[in-house]
């Protein structure tokens, strides 16, 4: 908390500009008018304020708007957004998609923070619904958000949202969601070459049908066991021992450790013992 002190003569801020970076915390508190700051918020991000100075600026806005910032200020918060707590954000009423995009941009590349999660909640409450533009925005910034959507909602997700997905983003997607996402991913990545294609499609293979797994087995992809374990059981069951061996490549030895777990367990039970013996892993059908 900065003490209330009078502003030194000649230091009263007439506008938000670079000269303010040389102000001490108490000088910012004393010499920057909160209303001026609110109207010139868009300038703050162009100025290399320290974290401590940003704390002072936030404090000034908090005093000016104890019930929560207006959207005109929120839209221009920029990096000051990272200073906001979920409690601060719960006071906001955010209805503009441009405001949402501006703040998501600040947090881009990071895990969905409690601040962002609260912002999304406020936005949905402010809008009353999640329309297609909002869903497209959220999934573009946070591809993991796809896993919060129903298969029906996922059916309208554009292929462009698929491009940004990283493997960890789909960790919480269930089989029915992957059933919807897999064909979209296949379409999105169709022009990539073999090894690049496999790297991109790998996360979505929990929705792949048998015929696609058979095709992959002919491409020396060396699928890891973690991916194999996420495949649909009904898609794995028709695969022959030879096809699974080709699909897994050097990782085939990992089947032994997973022999009690689906889909490996169910697949083993479908194979002839003679065929299983060719793997030399001691698998018992």
């Amino acid at each position: 908390e900065v003490e209330k002190t009078a502003c030194p003569s000649g230091k009263k801020a007439r506008e938000i500009d670079e000269s303010l970076i040389f102000y001490k915390k108490w000088e910012l508190e004393a010499c920057v008018d909160a209303a001026l700051l609110a109207t010139q918020m868009d300038r703050v991000n162009a100025i290399p304020f320290t974290y401590e100075q940003l704390d002072v600026l936030k404090h000034k806005l908090d005093e000016l708007y104890p019930q929560g910032y207006p959207e005109s200020v929120i839209q221009h918060l920029g990096y000051l957004f990272l200073k906001m707590s979920p409690e601060d954000i719960r006071k906001w009423n955010v209805t503009s998609l441009e405001t949402l995009k501006a703040l998501l941009e600040v947090n881009k590349g990071h895990e969905m923070s409690p601040q962002v999660a609260t912002l999304i909640d406020r936005f949905v409450k402010g809008r009353g619904q999640l329309d297609k533009d909002t869903l497209d925005t959220l999934t573009a910034f946070y591809p993991g958000y796809l896993c919060s959507l129903s298969p029906e909602e996922l059916s309208s997700v554009p292929p462009s949202s698929i491009w940004a997905v990283r493997p960890q983003d789909l960790d919480t997607c269930d089989p029915r969601q992957l059933d919807v996402l897999y064909p979209k991913a296949r379409l999105a990545f169709q022009n990539m070459n073999g090894s690049e294609y496999f790297v991109k499609i790998q996360s979505f293979l929990g929705g792949a049908p048998t015929e696609d797994l058979k095709a992959l087995s002919q491409q020396n992809v060396s699928m890891d066991l973690a991916t194999f374990m996420k495949l649909r059981t009904d898609a794995v069951l028709p695969l022959t021992v030879a096809e699974v061996q080709k699909l897994l490549g050097p990782h085939v030895e990992g089947l032994k450790a997973e022999e009690r777990h689906r889909p490996v367990r169910d697949w083993i039970l479908r194979q002839r013992q003679d065929d299983l013996d060719t793997l030399g892993l001691g698998l018992q059908g």
Epitope: P86, E111, A117, D121, Y142, G144, S148, S150, E153, T172
Partner: nanobody, 113 residues
Framework: DVQLQESGGGLVQAGGSLRLSCVGA????????IGWWRQAQGNQREWVAS???????NYEDFAKDRFTISRDNTKNTAYLQMNSLKPEDTAVYYC???????RGQGTQVTVSS
């Protein structure tokens, strides 16, 4: 900070019922889907059920006729009602906000024969 806390686990006889709860703090559940997973000793984690942002639901095959997932956004809580429990349902059950790394520590469910 975001915290999820499960409760409602315990020891129950085969054929019995339990209702698990998952309470969220630090974030509102309403824009997100919530999922339940379970992990038996020595096994991988196994997805049980999800309730999406829209309120529609989905279940793993073993859970379809016996388990029911629901949510109460006003209480920031998700539930898993488990009926006709079997010994093979014995596991630690935990909830997670779909699409995020936010998950609870889990609650132990033990079904005796």
């Amino acid at each position: 900070d975001v915290q999820l806390q499960e409760s409602g686990g315990g020891l129950v006889q085969a054929g019995g019922s339990l209702r698990l709860s998952c309470v969220g703090a630090g974030v509102s559940f309403s824009p997100y889907g919530i999922g339940w997973w379970r992990q038996a000793q020595g096994n991988q984690r196994e997805w049980v059920a999800s309730i999406y942002r829209s309120g529609s639901t989905n279940y793993e095959d073993f859970a379809k006729d016996r388990f029911t997932i629901s949510r109460d956004n006003t209480k920031n809580t998700a539930y898993l009602q488990m009926n006709s429990l079997k010994p093979e349902d014995t596991a630690v059950y935990y909830c997670q906000i779909l699409g995020t790394s936010y998950r609870g520590q889990g609650t132990q469910v033990t079904v005796s024969s």
